[in-house]
């Protein structure tokens, strides 16, 4: 009955503070409405990074002010988180909810450890 969610164990953000990873879920049923949430877990505290609800076959749309973007293809969601800094290094969990039709299913990934390294400032060139 449980829905399995797979995501990579580790991802290194780019020098521009962008990290991308795939969140894949094994849908027990034929969902038409799916909610994807990215959560950050630090010191056992969990906070929401971003969330989007989409209809199967349609594009994934995050809020305009979201730091996340994404695309969906079948049971796979390609997530990109932007504007990351070294202090944002942590475990990012992909949560998937099959909202419709019934029954509802919840899937929680094991999390992706995202490492963010702030770029060294360019040396002044005289």
């Amino acid at each position: 009955k449980a829905m399995h969610v797979a995501q990579p164990a580790v991802v290194l953000a780019s020098s521009r503070g962008i990290a991308s990873f795939v969140c894949e879920y094994a849908s027990p049923g034929k969902a038409t409405e799916v909610r994807v949430t990215v959560l950050r877990q630090a010191d056992s505290q969990v906070t929401e990074v971003c969330a989007a609800t989409y209809m199967m076959g349609n594009e994934l749309t995050f809020l305009d002010d979201s730091i996340c973007t994404g695309t969906s293809s079948g049971n796979q969601v390609n997530l990109t988180i932007q504007g990351l800094r070294a202090m944002d290094t942590g475990l990012y969990i992909c949560k998937v909810e099959l909202m419709y039709p019934p029954p509802y299913y919840l899937g929680i990934g094991n999390g992706t450890q995202i490492y963010v390294i702030d770029p060294e400032p360019c040396p002044d060139s005289d």
Partner: antibody, heavy 118, light 108 residues
Framework: QVQLVESGGGVVQPGRSLRLSCAAS????????MHWVRQAPGKGLEWVTF????????YYADSVKGRFTISRDNSKNTLTLEMNGLRPEDTAIYYC???????????WGQGTLVTVSS | EIVLTQSPGTLSLSPGERATLSCRAS???????LAWYQQKPGQAPRLLIY???SRATGIPDRFSGSGSGTDFTLTISRLEPEDFAVYYC?????????FGQGTKVEIK
């Protein structure tokens, strides 16, 4: 701090209606799914109904399907349970509960008692 | 529907003793989707354990959860006077959300 406060309970005759409310505060209400759970006197916990973030998706226990309606007003941070065709077996304390980020019910209200009796 | 069966129905123990509560599911429940709650008379339930073994905020480390598949356990390593209560397991991986019938931990 997170607070859930139920109201609207009372004594009602079989077949009549009652409307329960749950006022939420201390968190971004629209970011959480919500539930109603009930507990008959001296009995265990029974899940009653669920509502999604935007209120578009609702699920009900078979025992209340077609009689109870859950709704939410995200602008007023309020969860509502409309109960019609009440039966003596609906007598219980009704709790509203918030779904935590990882799925369990992390915060509960203090409950409101509904007694269905003639 | 996933049916959860808790045992024993009542556990009579003394403060300082170890309590072991069992929850068995009628079908496999992912360990990420199993919670334990504590309820004292006249109070709302309180989340203790989620994801089968993660303690909720503010829960003392004498409470621990374990198990996977269909068999789950809540252990209270040394019972304190405030631990005597009713404990419920719950699955939240799919609808309908279901609870076990509860285990009462009473003072012997």
């Amino acid at each position: 701090q997170v607070q859930l406060v139920e109201s609207g309970g009372g004594v009602v005759q079989p077949g009549r209606s009652l409307r329960l409310s749950c006022a939420a505060s201390g968190f971004t209400f629209s970011s959480y799914t919500m539930h109603w759970v009930r507990q008959a006197p001296g009995k265990g916990l029974e899940w009653v109904t669920f509502i999604s973030y935007d209120g578009n998706n609702k699920y009900y226990a078979d025992s209340v399907k077609g009689r109870f309606t859950i709704s939410r007003d995200n602008s007023k941070n309020t969860l509502t349970l409309e109960m019609n065709g009440l039966r003596p077996e609906d007598t219980a304390i009704y709790y509203c509960a918030r779904t935590g980020w990882l799925g369990p019910f992390d915060y509960w209200g203090q409950g409101t008692l509904v007694t269905v009796s003639s | 529907e996933i049916v959860l069966t808790q045992s024993p129905g009542t556990l009579s123990l003394s403060p300082g003793e170890r309590a072991t509560l069992s929850c068995r599911a009628s079908q496999s429940v992912g360990s990420s989707y199993l919670a334990w709650y504590q309820q004292k008379p006249g109070q709302a339930p309180r989340l203790l354990i989620y994801g089968a073994f993660s303690r909720a905020t503010g829960i003392p480390d004498r409470f621990s959860g374990s198990g996977s598949g269909t068999d789950f356990t809540l252990t209270i390593s040394r019972l304190e006077p405030e631990d005597f209560a009713v404990y419920y397991c719950q699955q939240y991986g799919s609808s309908p959300w279901t609870f076990g019938q509860g285990t009462k931990v009473e003072i012997k």
